[in-house]
């Protein structure tokens, strides 16, 4: 599942090798001056944005009980606001009634501590160049995390980090069709730690999902459900404090 492709490779020929909202390439690489707000700063894990870089971000500790990840998530009740400066994410809005994805974004969850399992509707399904970003913190004593991209009752893409499967940590990916799980794809690289913040990014490509964690490429998963426009919900569950879940087009 893992590969060495960069986002630059994936998008070369698209006319936009350095799309807005991403580092210069897929993975944990430094951003240039004034670039994507993912350059590390002292005290953060690599790739974490400095305070204020995410749109609408409040100062650290903006709401009580907020997970330690991404200091100062937007204040409760607001969607991310306009860009904070050059290189920030594009300005925010809600998807149009037609389900189209204009270049503005990100769309999705209200700010503040979200309740898992969390349901993120994806109106109109997923499309290539759609980027889903999930921020949170792994709870203590965690057993599992799961992302479920759903097409009706089918699970098009199940991404399932397991913290203790026979005393091993493993990420299992699979698809469920007509209530039957398919062949598992397993990944032993495991970037999650109990009690630690994380950022999961899922990039939809024409023939696969790409997953990066904490700005480092992790794996890709070839589409087994081909009708991408019918993958209309993302479920987020497991032993996490969920800070935000959103999507945008890049």
């Amino acid at each position: 599942m893992a590969d060495n492709f960069s986002l630059h490779d994936a998008l070369s020929g698209s006319g936009n090798p350095n799309p807005q909202g991403w580092p210069g390439a897929w993975g944990n690489q430094p951003a240039g001056a004034g670039g994507y707000p993912g350059a590390s700063y002292p005290g953060a894990y690599p790739g974490q944005a400095p305070p204020g870089a995410y749109p609408g971000q409040a100062p650290p500790g903006a709401y009580p009980g907020a997970p330690g990840a991404y200091p100062g998530a937007p204040a409760p009740g607001v969607y991310p606001g306009p860009p904070s400066g050059p290189g920030a994410y594009p300005s925010s809005g809600q998807p149009s009634a037609t389900g189209a994805y204009p270049a503005t974004g990100p769309y999705g969850a209200p700010a503040g501590p979200l309740i898992v399992p969390y349901n993120l509707p994806l109106p109109g399904g997923v499309v290539p160049r759609m980027l889903i970003t999930i921020l949170g913190t792994v709870k203590p004593n965690a057993n599992r995390i799961a992302l479920d991209f759903q097409r009706g009752n089918d699970v098009a893409f199940h991404f399932n980090p397991r913290f203790n499967e026979n005393n091993r940590r493993v990420i299992v990916c699979n698809t469920k069709l007509d209530n039957n799980w398919g062949r598992e794809e397993r990944q032993s690289v495991f970037p999650f730690e109990s009690g630690k913040p994380f950022k999961i990014q899922v990039l939809v490509e024409p023939d696969h999902f790409k997953v990066a964690v904490n700005d480092a490429h992790l794996l890709q998963y070839n589409h087994r459900v081909k009708k991408l426009n019918e993958i209309s919900k993302l479920g987020i569950s497991g032993d996490i404090d969920l800070t935000s879940a959103s999507y945008t087009m890049i």
């Epitope: 969607y79 969850a109 209200p110 979200l114 969390y118 349901n119 004593n141 965690a142 009752n153």
Partner: antibody
Framework: QVQLKQSGAELVRPGASVKLSCKAS????????INWVKQRPGQGLEWIAR????????DYNEKFKGRATLTAEKSSSTAYMQLSSLTSEDSAVYFC???????????????WGHGTTLTVSS | DILMTQSPSSMSVSLGDTVSITCHAS??????MGWLQQKPGKSFKGLIY???NLEDGVPSRFSGSGSGADYSLTISSLESEDFADYYC?????????FGSGTKLEIK
């Protein structure tokens, strides 16, 4: 069939503590969170906290943090809520309710206990 | 906290009628909401989750709709056992919050 059986009514003095129980049956205890919800006449419903019995991890309403303590005993499929420093404002009916741990198959506040009436009075 | 504004607070209806109850959230909740029923002197029962999905065993005369911040519960062809209190609940953001309830009474 799914059942959440709660402990009986309690009459306690102001300043005291009380521990309420909720015994689950008819389903796998670790497939759901157990939530605790307060209902006072004319005051509506108020969520207190929840526990995931599989790990013991909890989430609390800020309003009850420090006064409510949730625990769960997997061996007996029983969840507990201890409320401390009680005042007359805590007089209410307290319900336990289950809530899905896994995404995708329902079970969102679907089954509730019958409630425990707590009266705080001197 | 997210405020769930439920209306009406009560309604008198007849057997066989179709009724709708609405809930407005103070911000978008991405269909992370449900509907509950409480019969007089009894406990609660979940009817609908994720705005539109029926919980197991719930009759098909119950249906839910809505998105964003506005949601509704519709009961078609009311039966005698449907006269009860109904509550919406959001579970998008901590803490979960409930509507103030709608009492369905027999006309």
């Amino acid at each position: 069939q799914v059942q959440l059986k709660q402990s009986g009514a309690e009459l306690v003095r102001p300043g005291a503590s009380v521990k309420l129980s909720c015994k689950a049956s008819g389903y796998t205890f670790t497939d759901y969170y157990i939530n605790w919800v307060k209902q006072r006449p004319g005051q509506g419903l108020e969520w207190i906290a929840r526990i995931y019995p599989g790990t013991g991890n909890t989430d609390y309403n800020e309003k009850f943090k420090g006064r409510a303590t949730l625990t769960a005993e997997k061996s007996s499929s029983t969840a507990y809520m201890q409320l401390s420093s009680l005042t007359s404002e805590d007089s209410a009916v307290y319900f336990c309710a289950r809530f899905a741990y896994y995404y995708g198959s329902g079970g969102y506040f679907d089954y509730w206990g019958h409630g425990t009436t707590l009266t705080v009075s001197s | 906290d997210i405020l769930m504004t439920q209306s009406p607070s009560s309604m008198s209806v007849s057997l066989g009628d179709t009724v709708s109850i609405t809930c407005h959230a103070s911000q978008g909740i991405n269909s992370n909401m449900g509907w509950l029923q409480q019969k007089p002197g009894k406990s609660f029962k979940g009817l609908i989750y994720h705005a539109t999905n029926l919980e197991d065993g719930v009759p098909s005369r119950f249906s839910g709709s809505g998105s964003g911040a506005d949601y509704s519960l519709t009961i078609s062809s009311l039966e005698s056992e449907d006269f009860a209190d109904y509550y919406c609940v959001q579970y998008a953001q901590f803490p979960p919050t409930f509507g103030s309830g709608t009492k369905l009474e027999i006309k």
